[in-house]
Interface confidence: low
Amino acid sequence: KLTIESTPFNVAEGKEVLLLVHNLPQHLFGYSWYKGERVDGNRQIIGYVIGTQQATPGPAYSGREIIYPNASLLIQNIIQNDTGFYTLHVIKSDLVNEEATGQFRVYPELPKPSISSNNSKPVEDKDAVAFTCEPETQDATYLWWVNNQSLPVSPRLQLSNGNRTLTLFNVTRNDTASYKCETQNPVSARRSDSVILNVLYGPDAPTISPLNTSYRSGENLNLSCHAASNPPAQYSWFVNGTFQQSTQELFIPNITVNNSGSYTCQAHNSDTGLNRTTVTTITVYAEPPKPFITSNNSNPVEDEDAVALTCEPEIQNTTYLWWVNNQSLPVSPRLQLSNDNRTLTLLSVTRNDVGPYECGIQNELSVDHSDPVILNVLYGPDDPTISPSYTYYRPGVNLSLSCHAASNPPAQYSWLIDGNIQQHTQELFISNITEKNSGLYTCQANNSASGHSRTTVKTITVSAELPKPSISSNNSKPVEDKDAVAFTCEPEAQNTTYLWWVNGQSLPVSPRLQLSNGNRTLTLFNVTRNDARAYVCGIQNSVSANRSDPVTLDVLYGPDTPIISPPDSSYLSGANLNLSCHSASNPSPQYSWRINGIPQQHTQVLFIAKITPNNNGTYACFVSNLATGRNNSIVKSITVSASGTSPGLSAGA
């Protein structure tokens, strides 16, 4: 069938269009093009006789048309009037006629738009600004950009006049941004230059810095005032109500007690005409003496003794302050202050209470510090640790064990094997061990000052064969993207190869998987939910190879961003609203709903029967995983429309 294709269909003024003929019949006598949807001699553009290859212009010929032997028609330098239908009339050699109609549309190339504004210097929280995109153009679409982003959703932003006008109600300083408008039609899109909105605001309540209000006699007073304001504020200072100077900073050298009083900073914005003030009360004090600390016990025993630290000298009408490790006193039931704060008592001291301690005398708020004092807390011994941590040894090697226990003063050590005393040293050495050296090895640590002793027992097995290994983990329930997990293959044995499998496969290559400690420890960094697999370790030596039982990693994750279903956001009045929320999480999360910020039920499904426009709003599903301590949420806007609701009435007049 004879058809006409317009290339392009939407044509810009001044450009050209090709009316391309498809399925042109064979054995033609000639053809003619007509403007319009039918053959009309008065509207003939051009005719073409194939035999003579002669083209004859018709009444509608404009001089811009070119006809091709394949019957296609090229129209150049397109004008608006060219819009419409074009009919090709084909006369076959048998004089049978055939017709086909095509069409195209003509649009103007849009000019570069510009933005006009009804208010070049709007005042915050008072004025509105209406931006209008110029010029007004028919068949054009208007778009707006703020800081090169599409318009944010805001009740203070309103588009009108076919989107040609953007109104900002009650402008704020945050509306200071780059605004652009864009015009579009099917053949062009143009964007305006940016217009920067200059919002006048402030001054806000000024802040006076520094914040401290107490000074020592002889210091310099240097106060600075700042108030957020556009244009920048002008500042004035008043002392006890008397004007001082119109500067942002107030400097008084070598102050005395007489400089105590109320200091007022006034900020003024000449454009908004607003004034704001802030008052600070400055107190200047005389200097107190330097304090020092005395102690009732210079060598207290951990968990037994109390220590009383006293700040000297005793001065009437003075406030005493204390610092530990250069910080104010922590809240602790073991720390007690006397009524006058002069004595600090440490009940049942621990090794962490060594300090340093400082006290301060405060004559009002001018503070002098004492020299630091450090406590010598006697402690320990703690349970000794025996190293290395091997429990299996192969016959014929040397056994070398070392013992250490935290202690003040340092501990004295003794070794026992199967309860029999061996030697009073920190290290035990036995060469060329045999199976007979298997047994219980005990290290005893003794603190001569406290008289306390502690022991640790280690079972040593001298054997060539290794036992079935087991996997120990430093974290049984790791949190996704936060925790690392270290799997260790037990026991620790000399001259042993350690192997690992995940889900029955050898370890994949991954930067998050790391083998260490002679491959005995497998660490998974930043675990993910995909790491919840079966882990197996194997040990191998010259005479044995064994595999552990699998350990499955239980990774806690989520909750992920929930999904509310169904996805619909528009409902008709009278329908039932049945929203279901789902979030991937381990363990399963707790669900709760909020409608317009108001808490609803703690269920996964929210059901509201027979909704009305009053049910319009934001529906938020909150998910919480108590195990990971993480929360997530998603907000969905639901619109309930009365049948045929008027958008023109939803927002205003």
């Epitope: 009804n118 009108s160 006049n161 006008t165 009053n614 007049a653």
Partner: antibody, heavy 120, light 106 residues
Framework: EVQLQQSGPGLVRPSQTLSLTCTAS????????MHWVRQPPGRGLEWIGW????????EYAPKFRGRVTMLADTSKNQFSLRLSSVTAADTAVYYC?????????????WGQGTLVTVSS | DIQMTQSPSSLSASVGDRVTITCSAS?????MHWYQQKPGKAPKLLIY???NLASGVPSRFSGSGSGTDYTFTISSLQPEDIATYYC?????????FGQGTKLEIK
């Protein structure tokens, strides 16, 4: 300048049909929702309904459903109200009304009102 | 339908007085709108969306409220303010008006 000019008879016989027309100038009715409101003598305002001239959609107050018809002719930039089977209780001043947004300003325009008396 | 109850139904005040009219809706509405109507004239919008002043309306008129309870205030009554004032809700169809408050000068 935006204007709404109402026309129609001031007297209608009981059981007949009240018919009023509102002709708009200064704006295109196609871009707005056009309302009808009435006010019985010495009483308050009563909303009858609206029409969206662009597509003919209507919303009527339940009280008038079954009796009211609103039509629009965008080529003439006018819209009409027809209220059938009228009684003396339908005696009122009838207003046509449009709400237009110009920038951030809410512009509210009303016809001059037509007092329709239902009487034999 | 949402019923709108205006009070008082009429009030008399002196020039310069502060005048307050309240409107109570039978169920919660998003906004309240306020109209002024002078005898023989069409209503004129004064306040839209609870608190916004319509174009050309003097700043002595104001509105406030939320939910079901709304207030319309004239801060300093002027002789030309003599009229009947109506509240209107547009949250739910049918749109409904209050019964009106007739304001007179003492």
């Amino acid at each position: 300048e935006v204007q709404l000019q109402q026309s129609g008879p001031g007297l209608v016989r009981p059981s007949q049909t009240l018919s009023l027309t509102c002709t708009a100038s200064g704006f295109n009715i196609k871009d707005n929702y056009m309302h009808w409101v009435r006010q019985p003598p010495g009483r308050g305002l009563e909303w009858i309904g609206w029409i969206d001239p662009e597509n003919g959609d209507t919303e009527y107050a339940p009280k008038f459903r079954g009796r009211v018809t609103m039509l629009a002719d965008t080529s003439k930039n006018q819209f009409s109200l027809r209220l059938s089977s009228v009684t003396a209780a339908d005696t009122a001043v009838y207003y046509c009304h449009v709400l237009i947004y110009a920038g951030y300003l809410a512009m509210d325009y009303w016809g001059q009102g037509t007092l329709v008396t239902v009487s034999s | 339908d949402i019923q709108m109850t205006q009070s008082p139904s009429s009030l008399s005040a002196s020039v310069g007085d502060r005048v307050t009219i309240t409107c109570s809706a039978s169920s919660s509405v998003t906004y309240m709108h306020w109209y002024q109507q002078k005898p023989g004239k069409a209503p004129k919008l004064l306040i839209y969306s609870t608190s916004n002043l319509a174009s050309g309306v003097p700043s002595r008129f104001s509105g406030s409220g939320s939910g079901t309870d709304y207030t319309f205030t004239i801060s300093s009554l002027q002789p030309e303010d003599i009229a009947t004032y109506y509240c209107q809700q547009r949250s739910t169809y049918p749109l409904t008006f209050g019964q009106g408050t007739k304001l007179e000068i003492k």
